[in-house]
Structure formats: C-alpha cells, structure tokens
C-alpha cells in the first residue's frame, strides 16, 4: 500500500536587509506566467549564494511570497512583481508561505516515534 503525501503549510514574516548585490533571490509566477496550476502566485525559484536571503537562511526555494512590505502580490503580472521587489527599499518585509512535504505511511501503520495514542 502506498503512503499518502501531505503538505504542512506555514506562514512566516521575514525581514531582509538589502545587501550589496540586493536581496539575492529569483522569482517565478504571476498572472502571465503561472508556475503552479491554477495559481498565479509568486514563488521563489532560486536563492543566490551569499546573497541577503541566503545569509538570513529563512527564505527557501519553493516558498510562495504573499506580500512585500504589506503589499499583496495577488493578481500581479510577473514584471510588476519583479518591479515591486526592486523598488521595495533597503529594509524589506516578506510574508511567505512555506509548504513542507510530509510523507505519511500506509493507513494503519504507525511510524517509529509516533504517539501510541
């Protein structure tokens, strides 16, 4: 019997300080470039080595960015989202959604370390 793949979704506020080479990450997504099916949201595609995001350590590739400095990223064209980041100033506050994959065992199987109930 195959295990079920579930996702644990958490949100986090990440405050970054723009470094000498900027914020140090790439994005995909937007209304004109859907990266996830039926979702025009903005996703982190690359974290650049030694950049501000990498040094901070909290932002991860695959994270969905919900807002920048309180401004919602819903229903934005890709380039408009890029411009929003570029014009976000020195101190940048990101509201992000982490989606962690949780591998569950077959139904009826209790993995090691699971509470016995």
């Amino acid at each position: 019997m195959n295990g079920r793949v579930d996702y644990l979704v958490t949100e986090e506020e990440i405050n970054l300080t723009r470094g000498p080479s900027g914020l140090g990450f790439n994005i995909v997504g937007g209304t004109d470039q859907q990266y996830v099916s039926n979702d025009s949201g903005i996703y982190v595609s690359r974290i650049k080595e030694n950049g501000a995001a990498a040094l901070d350590g909290r932002l991860q590739e695959g994270d969905k960015i919900l807002s920048v400095n309180g401004q919602d990223l819903k229903n934005l064209l890709h380039q408009d989202a890029v411009d929003l980041f570029r014009n976000a100033g020195y101190a940048v506050s990101l509201r992000v959604q982490h989606r962690l994959q949780v591998q569950n065992g077959p139904i009826g199987h209790r993995g090691e370390g699971d509470p016995s109930g």
Epitope: G22, L23, F25, N26, I27, Q79, F85, R86
Partner: nanobody, 125 residues
Framework: QVQLVESGGGLVQPGGSVRVSCVSS????????IGWFRQAPGKEREGVSC???????YYVDSVKGRFTISRDNAKNTVYLQMNSLKPEDTAVYYC????????????????????WGQGTQVTVS
C-alpha cells in the same frame, strides 16, 4: 543535469550576418531567463542581449538595432541573430541560463546566472 551548448559561430566579413544558437537540456526553458554574453581577448565578459522568463528582450546599446534575440521553447533553443557585424563584435559568445527573474537586476547582469555554455567564437574580419 543542466547543459547549454552554443553553435553557429565562425568567420564573418564586416557588415555580414551570423546566427548563433543555444540549445538547452536538463530543464524546460519556459521559466528561465537566457542571456548572451561575449568576451573579447583581454577584456571582461559583457552582456549583449537576454530574454527574460516571460519573453521580454533586452539589449546593450552597442548592439541595439543590429542584434535580435529569440527563443523557441518547443525546441529548447535560444537564438541570437547578429546583423551589420563590426570588427569590435569579435569575441567568444556564451549563453547562460537562470531559473526565474532576479529581483535585483535585469537579465543583462552576468552575476545572476547559474548555468553557462562553453561558448562559440565569432570573428569579424
């Protein structure tokens, strides 16, 4: 494994044309920015043209109106058509790929790229 292979360079007369190609493998072009860069002997590598992940093209001033970048996602290939070539266009031409759009700089910035081809020589003489 990501791989970029350039082809199509060679010896061209001043005023002539050439098209260089960059074929990618190991990834789907759709979400990638692709840049063309060149390096002449004794000089630093410089951005020439690029096309971002949504198809917007950029050019440095020295090639505007002479060079045209295009992409064929179905063939996983990006082309750089170079017309009205000048001796100063002589260089090794490299293509590079980057996943998504940098939030820091346009795709003409070579520091943003993770993947590079081996280059193809274009000599205008």
């Amino acid at each position: 494994q990501v791989q970029l292979v350039e082809s199509g360079g060679g010896l061209v007369q001043p005023g002539g044309s050439v098209r260089v190609s960059c074929v990618s493998s190991g990834f789907i072009l759709d979400y990638y920015a692709i840049g063309w860069f060149r390096q002449a002997p004794g000089k630093e590598r410089e951005g020439v043209s690029c096309i971002d992940s949504v198809g917007r093209a950029y050019y440095v001033d020295s090639v505007k109106g002479r060079f045209t970048i295009s992409r064929d996602n179905a063939k996983n290939t990006v082309y750089l058509q170079m017309n009205s070539l000048k001796p100063e266009d002589t260089a090794v031409y490299y293509c590079a790929a980057d996943f998504g759009s940098s939030v820091d700089s346009t795709c003409l910035n070579n520091r943003q790229y993770d993947y590079w081809g081996q280059g193809t020589q274009v000599t205008v003489s």
